[in-house]
């Protein structure tokens, strides 16, 4: 009785169960009554990452420097190449096919999370008591100067973009 379903790591063809090719190898010939499935290793620039019956291996991803990409992890016969972005850039999408410069946080905003090769800068508005007067991809909101600790008084209130201005206390006569 020919099988209608096969075990794990097998496939059904010509009414018989054949072994799938292991990761890193492609199918050359299906099994027969006399021989097991024939598989061959993927070439150096190719890979297959699952048990398969593919007749062609997949090409490793190319990390194009013109798109700001570099190799984070070299591909093997069983894994694809992993690309990441050059310093100062991050991936445009999850598949990381190209890179864009990290955004800077404008004055009034500080860096909540510094960008990585795969994620952009996350900015946050400076809360009361903090300010940022620069456009930066690294600077957090800085606290206003404490005039009191310097034995000074506030002459000009701070904003989210400016620090307080301290001055000497008025002398009492």
């Amino acid at each position: 009785e020919p099988p209608t379903a096969c075990r794990e790591k097998q496939y059904l063809i010509n009414s018989q169960c054949c072994s799938l090719c292991q990761p890193g190898q492609k199918l050359v010939s299906d099994c027969t009554e006399f021989t097991e499935t024939e598989c061959l290793p993927c070439s150096e620039s190719e890979f297959l990452d699952t048990w398969n019956r593919e007749t062609r291996c997949h090409q490793h991803k190319y990390c194009d420097p013109n798109l700001g990409l570099r190799v984070q992890q070299k591909g093997t016969s069983e894994t694809d190449t992993i690309c990441t972005c050059e310093e100062g850039l991050h991936c445009m999408s999850e598949s990381c096919e190209s890179c864009v410069p990290h955004r800077s946080c404008l004055p009034g905003f500080g860096v909540k999370q510094i960008a990585t090769g795969v994620s952009d800068t996350i900015c946050e508005p400076c809360p009361v008591g903090f300010f940022s007067n620069v456009s930066s991809a690294f600077e957090k909101c800085r606290p206003w100067t404490s005039c009191e600790t310097k034995d000074l008084v506030v002459q000009q209130a701070g904003t989210n973009k400016t620090d307080v201005v301290c001055g000497p206390q008025d002398r009492q006569r």
Partner: antibody, heavy 113, light 108 residues
Framework: EVQLQQSGPELVKPGASVKIPCKAS????????MDWVKQSHGKSLEWIGD????????IYNQKFRGKATLTVDKSSSTAYMELRSLTSEDTAVYYC??????WGQGTLVTVSA | EIVLTQSPTTMAASPGEKITITCSAS???????LHWYQQKPGSSPKVLIY???NLASGVPVRFSGSGSGTSYSLTIGTMEAEDVATYYC?????????FGGGTKLEIK
Amino acid sequence: EVQLQQSGPELVKPGASVKIPCKASGYTFTDYNMDWVKQSHGKSLEWIGDINPNNDISIYNQKFRGKATLTVDKSSSTAYMELRSLTSEDTAVYYCARRFAYWGQGTLVTVSA
Amino acid sequence: EIVLTQSPTTMAASPGEKITITCSASSSISSNYLHWYQQKPGSSPKVLIYRTSNLASGVPVRFSGSGSGTSYSLTIGTMEAEDVATYYCQQGSSIPYTFGGGTKLEIK
């Protein structure tokens, strides 16, 4: 009826090459791999390799890499095995077989000066 | 590579006698891919039994096969004069495919 027709005996000089044909009939040539097997006089059988006529990919026994080259001509349903740099060690009967189920009658190759 | 060792290498039997030839593999083989061939002098090998125990078309029922893992056998229930030949086991489980050294069967 499946038939594999091989050529007659070959007498070749040491260092020369020989190309043995195996003409298939009675089935769709591209449906089955063709295997090649060596049998030295009074000895057992040795698998040389096989070729898939569908994709022209051949797989070799490591022992025969560089010695044997397998090819096919789909238009004439013929498989070929070329043996090169022949020595007396290559004197043997060579069989083609359709995945071991059907065998050719064999071709005797004698290497002698 | 998988080495197949056959025993005996040669044997002589009387007509009507029961014959058993064994084939031992150096590592385990899927029973789906162990086969037996008969070769008569001056002829090509002919499939006798495929996939351990399946009789090839036109082969007399006195031939049978069994086994699993690394141990396989071919049995001739009652020897006949026409069974004089060399018998080979072969594995198609892993490349390179290999054959046993052969068992030459003669008649007493």
